[in-house]
């Protein structure tokens, strides 16, 4: 299973649920669905309040039980380490795959943390991060921001990923903006 890691803003906008959580239990495989279930302890929710309701608590995250069909494998054995998890809701359950954005909270830049906490949501409605994977690539719309990190750095951990968000500048126009300047 291969997929291009998304810009964190894309991950935020395309996910039903974005939370901070610790992986606390041994994974279990469901004998009916063939999904693997990880027990988690949610510490923060950044997106999904409407979908879940205010009192909701996510206790498990689900993923296919085999790598070749994009199952997510959690490598960390540190049960106190917090992870940012951006996933999809299916029948009220949080699902993730290899292609989902799952990252140690401590590995995120301060700008990314700010993005997940409050800024990425501003760009979800109108703006689109548009991946540039090969030259030439050009903007197809004024609401697109060209994402060139992978082209220039060969990595999703480039400057645009770590420090910028694609946000509305004016109606019909989105531009890369520094998340540093978004401090309230």
């Amino acid at each position: 299973c291969t997929c291009v890691p998304p810009h964190p803003q894309t991950a935020f906008c395309n996910s039903d649920l974005v939370i901070r959580a610790k992986f606390v239990g041994t994974p279990e495989v469901n004998q009916t669905t063939l999904y693997q279930r990880y027990e988690i302890k949610m510490t923060k929710m950044y997106k999904g309040f409407q979908a879940l309701g205010d009192a909701a608590d996510i206790r498990f995250v689900y993923t296919p039980a085999m790598e070749s069909v994009c199952g997510y494998f959690h490598r960390s054995h540190n049960r106190s380490e917090e992870f940012l998890i951006a996933g999809k809701l299916q029948d009220g359950l949080l699902h993730i795959t290899t292609c989902s954005f799952v990252a140690p909270w401590n590995s995120l830049s301060l700008a990314q943390r700010r993005g997940f906490t409050k800024t990425y949501t501003v760009g979800c409605e109108e703006c689109t991060v548009f991946p540039c994977l090969s030259i030439p690539c050009k903007l197809q719309s004024g609401t697109h921001c060209l994402w060139t990190d992978q082209l220039l750095q060969g990595s999703e951990k480039g400057f645009q990923s770590r420090h910028l968000a694609c946000l509305p500048r004016e109606p019909g126009l989105c531009t890369w903006q520094s998340l540093r300047s978004q401090i309230a």
Partner: antibody
Framework: QVQLVESGGGLVQPGGSLRLSCAAS????????MSWVRQAPGKGLEWVSG????????FYADSVKGRFTISRDNSKNTLYLQMNSLRAEDTAVYYC??????WGQGTLVTVSS | DIALTQPASVSGSPGQSITISCTGT?????????VSWYQQHPGKAPKLMIY???NRPSGVSNRFSGSKSGNTASLTISGLQAEDEADYYC??????????FGGGTKLTVLG
């Protein structure tokens, strides 16, 4: 009682195709993932393929990926394995299993010219 | 391509206890509590004897027990009987290969 009965095995030439069936009874078929496991003559067990209860998730061993297709018909309580581009090394007794707790008696597939 | 390592053969006299080991890695045996053991008599289908490391299905004699330490699982048969003579296979869940088996162990009951 819980029962699985395989059928469809036989002699086939290399490059040929065969479709195995597994008729299930005695339990709620759609509530269980099912698997195919094979055993070459005088050898050990090898997992081949698996399918979730609703047929949404499907897994294959690398040795059969792209050649074998697993499917199920929950209305008929039947599991299938479509085997294409068969090779001599696919010769084995093929068992269907409910998850891995109940097994059928197996059906022999021989690939030979 | 055998994923889990079992001794090719073990033997014991009636009434004795024997143990069959099954060694994997932290990615299979060591990483999950999904180890099963099967008994297979010649020309017959495998029969589940132990699941989830140490659980016995109903109808299986309590002379059969399972355990796990690190990356190695074990099947112990106490009070060995003639009908225990068979091949025994261990199996484990593995995230990459889904389900992996050991190469099998031939148990011979002496005498």
């Amino acid at each position: 009682q819980v029962q699985l009965v395989e059928s469809g095995g036989g002699l086939v030439q290399p490059g040929g195709s065969l479709r195995l069936s597994c008729a299930a009874s005695g339990f709620t078929f759609s509530s269980y993932a099912m698997s195919w496991v094979r055993q070459a003559p005088g050898k050990g067990l090898e997992w081949v393929s698996g399918i979730s209860g609703n047929g949404v998730l499907i897994f294959y061993a690398d040795s059969v990926k792209g050649r074998f297709t697993i499917s199920r018909d929950n209305s008929k309580n039947t599991l299938y394995l479509q085997m294409n581009s068969l090779r001599a090394e696919d010769t084995a007794v093929y068992y269907c299993a409910r998850w891995f707790d109940v097994w059928g008696q197996g059906t022999l597939v021989t690939v030979s010219s | 391509d055998i994923a889990l390592t079992q001794p090719a053969s073990v033997s014991g006299s009636p009434g004795q206890s024997i143990t069959i080991s099954c060694t994997g890695t932290s990615s299979d045996v060591g990483g999950y509590n999904y180890v099963s053991w099967y008994q297979q008599h010649p020309g017959k289908a495998p029969k589940l004897m132990i699941y989830d490391v140490s659980n016995r299905p109903s109808g299986v004699s309590n002379r059969f027990s399972g355990s796990k330490s690190g990356n190695t699982a074990s099947l112990t048969i106490s009070g060995l009987q003639a009908e225990d003579e068979a091949d025994y296979y261990c199996q484990s869940y593995d995230f990459v290969r889904f389900m992996v088996f050991g190469g099998g162990t031939k148990l011979t009951v002496l005498g």
